[in-house]
């Protein structure tokens, strides 16, 4: 779905970290920890040497609710985005890199330590490059892994 | 197999509300989208709202969100549908119909239908 | 709300005929858009989804296409049972919105 700019399952875990509140994670994984601005996830994925991953994504879209479930409801998904600094939005940032081929929902962009935009780790449509569907979750695994493992081959 | 059994016939007199069931089968129940669509006498197809029966998160018609309230018991895997202050225009058949298996919005299986009739 | 115009509102053709129905959307849609066929006194079935995918025990001889806002659905050659009401729905926003219809009858 386009969008123009617009203002802004629970993981079975023994973890012991307090629940966030639902108004970070957005139900995007209410146990994981969600960075609040752009701004703070591209400071801490600097600074941790963590990749980044960012989900643009509209309350009112029901692409965007459909692709929150199953990435909620999928543990591995989950497991792994612990070691992404994370951010969900649901208004556009002013960095045009974040929206390499258009403002649609949802979509899921990766950013290097660097602060390099990986526009090479794409979804499967030539014409929303970035965007995912719930059948898409095996693509977008694999594509966390290979965020993360280029991460470490840069090192 | 995939089955959406849904409950039979009602008739209502105006400003009542009615309570149509939609009990599923075949599938893991709280990971699709449950749709509610309508279809009155000799016209289109109409749709209503969803429902993620995993969690309870709907999203309605803005036509219907007054009056609809869109309900899932987990234990039952059964999902509802409730109208109220029913009108003669609300006469029709509703239909529940799944989301994709893998959690799409896309409409895949249908209820046959449970004809609401509304009259004084 | 989107608003979805089939046409033609009644195709008038033979069994062997090649059908072809149309959908067309106010506005981009991508390629959220389904088929499907209805028969008097039954439930709607899925035919097709995301504007090309065919529904499993589907036949082939049904399909799909079109992106943005122009969309068909083509039956390659009508078999009797084909004789129906068609629809298409847009599932790119909320709310869903179907087509008028389109009603494949005995020429």
């Known amino acids: 779905r386009d969008t123009t700019v617009k203002p802004g399952a629970k993981k079975d875990t023994k973890d012991s970290r307090p629940k966030l509140p639902q108004t970070l994670s957005r139900g995007w994984g209410d146990q994981l920890i969600w960075t609040q601005t752009y701004e703070e996830a591209l400071y801490k994925s600097k600074t941790s040497n963590k990749p980044l991953m960012i989900i643009h994504h509209l309350d009112e879209c029901p692409h965007s609710q459909a692709l929150k479930k199953v990435f909620a409801e999928n543990k591995e998904i989950q497991k792994l985005a612990e070691q992404f600094v994370l951010l969900n939005l649901v208004y556009e940032t002013t960095d045009k890199h974040l929206s390499p081929d258009g403002q649609y929902v949802p979509r899921i962009l990766f950013v290097d330590p660097s602060l390099t935009v990986r526009a090479d780790i794409t979804g499967r449509y030539s014409n929303r490059l970035y965007a995912y569907e719930p059948a898409d979750t095996a693509l977008l695994l694999d594509n966390m892994k290979k965020a993360l493992k280029l991460l470490k081959t840069e090192l | 197999q995939v089955q959406l059994v849904q409950s039979g016939a009602e008739v209502k007199k105006p400003g009542a509300s009615v309570k149509v069931s939609c009990k599923t089968s075949g599938y893991v129940f709280s990971r699709s989208w449950m749709n509610w669509v309508r279809q009155a006498p000799g016209q289109g197809l109409e749709w209503i709202g969803w429902?993620?029966?995993?969690?309870?998160?709907?999203n309605y018609n803005g036509k219907f969100k007054d009056r609809v309230t869109l309900t899932a018991d987990k234990s039952t895997s059964t999902v509802y549908m409730e109208l109220s202050s029913l009108r003669s225009e609300d006469t029709a058949v509703y239909f529940c119909a799944r989301g994709g298996y893998d959690g799409s919005p896309w409409l895949s299986y249908w209820g046959q239908g449970t004809l609401v009739t509304v009259s004084s | 709300e989107i608003v979805l115009t089939q046409s033609p509102a009644t195709l008038s053709l033979s069994p062997g005929e090649r059908a072809t129905l149309s959908c067309k959307a106010s506005q981009d849609i991508n390629s959220y858009l389904s088929w499907f066929q209805q028969k008097p006194g039954q439930a709607p079935r899925t035919l097709i989804y995301?504007?090309?995918r065919l529904v499993d025990g589907i036949p082939a001889r049904f399909s799909g296409s079109g992106s943005g806002q122009d969309f068909t659905l083509t039956i390659s050659s009508l078999e009797p049972e084909d004789f129906a009401v068609y629809y298409c729905l847009q599932y790119d926003e909320f709310p869903f919105t179907f087509g008028g219809g389109t009603k494949v009858e005995i020429k």
């Open positions: 995301r504007a090309n």
């Open positions: 429902i993620y029966p995993g969690d309870g998160d709907t």
